[in-house]
């Protein structure tokens, strides 16, 4: 008799998930000498242990603590770039500006980027058919809890001036319900962080509006200021030119507003 399986609203575990995590771990530790001591098999075992045989709506941050411990990594605390709804450009930026780091430039963020995973209660199986959707099913699912955990730790580690890249094309440039708005903003430490600088990325070529005056940016400014962290904001009118100028800062066209 085929065993009844819970149907969730979200897509199932990414195919070849164990192999992907292990391969990413090996690749990352080869590229980053400071992480060469990491045992990737142990990392996978800890990752797996966080969700296998557990109800996928009952995952806690504690479940991920063994993985967090193995993935402990020191990034320069004053070189952190947060982002919200504009991941690709943020990653393009840190690929050029090698001394700055997004969460996905760390081992744990790199391992899980764009992947989905979940298990089933009381079985050692990975569920490749479906996984809980954050809205439709439950928020305490393996993927959401993972990102909440690593995002909190990443924000807590930040110091001095922290940058955040925001998508100016969205109706809510700053969204209180995003990971940035609900987790990272509230875990920046006022004792260590002096300023949060927002970069609002414009979408349209002819868009000359000052999006730093957007009501949602004002909301972010107020939230951050009340954490006793100063706030500043810059419009990035031409993201293509912005990246080009990061690559070639001597270019004469890079002195004007980007």
């Amino acid at each position: 008799v085929p065993r009844w399986r819970q149907q969730w609203s979200g897509p199932g575990t990414t195919k070849r998930f164990p192999e992907t995590v292990l391969a990413r771990c090996v690749k990352y530790t080869e590229i980053h000498p400071e992480m060469r001591h990491v045992d990737c098999q142990s990392v996978w075992d800890a990752f797996k242990g966080a969700f296998i045989s557990k109800h996928p709506c009952n995952i806690t941050e504690e479940d991920y603590q063994p993985l967090m411990k193995l993935g402990t990594q020191t990034v320069p605390c004053n070189k952190i770039l947060l982002w919200s709804r504009i991941k690709d450009l943020a990653h393009q930026f840190t690929q050029v500006q090698r001394d700055m780091f997004t969460l996905e430039d760390t081992l744990l963020g790199y391992l899980a980027d764009d992947l989905t995973w979940c298990g089933e209660f009381n079985t050692s199986k990975i569920n490749y058919q479906s996984c809980p959707d954050w809205r439709k099913d439950c928020s305490n699912n393996p993927v959401s809890v993972f990102w909440k955990t690593v995002s909190r730790r990443f924000a807590e580690a930040a110091c001095d001036v922290v940058h955040v890249m925001l998508n100016g094309s969205r109706s809510k440039i700053f969204d209180k319900n995003s990971t940035f708005g609900s987790v990272e903003v509230h875990n920046l430490q006022p004792e260590k962080v002096q300023t949060l600088e927002a970069w609002v990325i414009h979408g349209g070529r002819e868009d000359s509006r000052d999006l730093c005056q957007d009501p949602t940016i004002k909301e972010l400014e107020s939230i951050i200021s009340k954490r006793n962290i100063q706030f500043s904001c810059k419009n990035i009118y031409r993201p293509d030119k912005f990246l080009q100028c990061v690559k070639n800062p001597e270019d004469s066209s890079c002195t004007s507003e980007i």
């Epitope: 954490r227 006793n228 100063q230 500043s232």
Partner: antibody, heavy 115, light 111 residues
């Protein structure tokens, strides 16, 4: 240091602008709060101006006061003073770091509203 | 609007003794810790003592300490000195800036 100026005797209804000036640093790069204290009374939080120029006011102060900034100063305008506005007015800067925390205060400027 | 109630006032203390001043807010301050304490002497502007509920401001003697979170906060002065005679104010910051307010003040008399 910071210093307030512009305090004087005015008649009720006469608009008055107080100015906060800094020496040794630029006020435009810091959060600035205005506070007042009536003779023999406690402190009252009036409002704050952010680095960006965004302003927020205490509920009781909305519509009665306006905070604005230039490159070097921060102003507090009292639109239509009444005798209840008689007080020493302080500006306080969140310098060198911070926002609503007030480590740097001016000596205050006295405003007297009387007919 | 938020109401910050300071107790007691006035409070009397002997040199070398300990003074405790309470500040109770009618609603929770931002992040449960955005409350600061100020000391004011006659004819002078206020002086920052404690911020974010428990962080000692630069140059402030360690006999001053702050504690509490949410709606209940305490300023403690241990080994009181005659120079500590002053009025002490708490300042609460709230989600709605319209609610931001100082407490009514607590006068400390040193005998």
């Amino acid at each position: 240091s910071v210093e307030e100026s512009g305090g004087r005797l005015v008649t009720p209804g006469t608009p008055l602008t107080l100015t906060c000036t800094a020496s040794g640093f630029s006020l435009s790069r810091y959060y600035v709060t205005w506070v007042r204290q009536a003779p023999g009374k406690g402190l009252e939080w009036i409002g704050i101006i952010y680095i960006s120029g965004t302003t927020y006011y205490a509920t009781w102060a909305k519509g009665r006061f306006t905070i604005s900034k230039s490159a070097t100063t921060v102003d507090l305008r009292i639109a239509s003073p009444t005798t209840e506005d008689t007080a020493t007015y302080f500006c306080a800067a969140a310098w060198p770091v911070g926002t609503y925390v007030l480590p740097l205060w001016g000596p205050g400027t006295l405003v007297t509203v009387s007919s | 609007a938020a109401v910050l109630t300071q107790t007691p006032s006035p409070v009397s203390a002997a040199v070398g003794g300990t003074v405790t001043i309470k500040c109770q807010s009618s609603q929770s301050v931002v992040n449960a810790n955005n409350l600061s304490w100020y000391q004011q002497k006659p004819g002078q502007p206020p002086k920052l003592l404690i911020y974010l509920a428990s962080t000692l401001a630069s140059g402030v003697p360690s006999r001053f300490s702050g504690s509490g979170s949410g709606t209940q906060f305490t300023l403690t002065i241990s080994s009181v000195q005659s120079d500590d005679a002053a009025t002490y104010y708490c300042l609460g910051v709230y989600d709605d800036d319209g609610d931001n307010a100082f407490g009514g003040g607590t006068e400390v008399v040193v005998k």
